[in-house]
């Protein structure tokens, strides 16, 4: 048995930040689980991990330098990514592993979410207008 995962097909990070919600066909309440977000078609980069344990506080971390936070719902984990760069535009995949109680469960690979990071194009308006021409 595999857990099914639903993600938005595309998200745009206008302010270099984005909320990506991973929705599961499984209730995570009172489970030990490891939810992770992976970057790239080959999921080579583990962007962020949310670890939940019925006896502990939720743990969120990144070993790959991403600024991330996580929020848990009964059947979802939302990853909040900040300080994203334009060159981090890519496809991102949600992964879920339930470690306890047995049996171990993981997900069918989802379709992923393309996160399009828009650069901040600042167009400074002059404080003082230049001399007007007659």
């Amino acid at each position: 048995n595999k857990i099914l995962v639903k993600q938005s097909p595309m998200l745009v990070a206008y302010d270099n930040a984005v909320n990506l919600s991973c929705k599961y066909s499984y209730n995570l309440f009172s489970r030990e689980f490891r939810a992770s977000l992976h970057k790239g078609l080959d999921s080579a980069v583990e962007v962020c991990v949310v670890y939940g344990n019925y006896s502990q506080q939720l743990q969120v971390y990144s070993k790959t330098g991403f600024n991330c936070d996580g929020k848990l719902g009964n059947e979802s984990v939302t990853f909040y990514l900040q300080n994203l760069y334009v060159n981090q535009t890519d496809i991102y995949f949600c992964k879920i592993e339930v470690m306890y109680p047995p049996p171990y469960l993981d997900n069918e690979k989802s379709n992923g979410t393309i996160i399009h990071v828009k650069g901040k194009h600042l167009c400074p308006s002059p404080l003082f207008p230049g001399p007007s021409k007659p």
Epitope: E32, R34, K63, M99
Partner: nanobody, 121 residues
Framework: EVQLVESGGGLVQPGGSLRLSCAAS????????MEWYRRTPETQREWVAT???????NYPDSVKGRFTISRDDTKKTVYLQMNSLKPEDTAVYYC???????????????WGQGTLVTVSS
């Protein structure tokens, strides 16, 4: 990276016994839950036994009373004692461990390559 290596598989007659071992190595800070799973060409992964870091054990009905899981944390090894083996126990047996590599970081999941158990006369 954590590595898991299973051993102890082989050919055994129905009603016989085997003891499987799974040794963990690599950068291990702590071993948490350790488990055995099995797979045949016809079936999906099937859970066989679980032992938590506190020593609590769980088994599915199909092996309860015949199989016993145990662990030796000083050797970073988990064992599966299999008695009263049946032909339907024939499978590749895989070790699964939940382990922490670094203090302060949550654990990850690791799998061994498997060891073949054949029950046949």
């Amino acid at each position: 990276e954590v590595q898991l290596v299973e051993s102890g598989g082989g050919l055994v007659q129905p009603g016989g016994s085997l003891r499987l071992s799974c040794a963990a190595s690599g950068s291990i800070f702590r071993l948490h839950t350790m488990e055995w799973y099995r797979r045949t060409p016809e079936t999906q992964r099937e859970w066989v036994a679980t032992i938590t870091s506190g020593g609590t054990t769980n088994y599915p009905d199909s092996v309860k009373g015949r199989f016993t899981i145990s662990r030796d944390d000083t050797k970073k090894t988990v064992y599966l004692q299999m008695n009263s083996l049946k032909p339907e126990d024939t499978a590749v047996y895989y070790c699964h461990a939940v382990a922490t590599e670094d203090a302060g970081f949550p654990p990850s999941n690791y799998w061994g390559q498997g060891t073949l158990v054949t029950v046949s006369s």
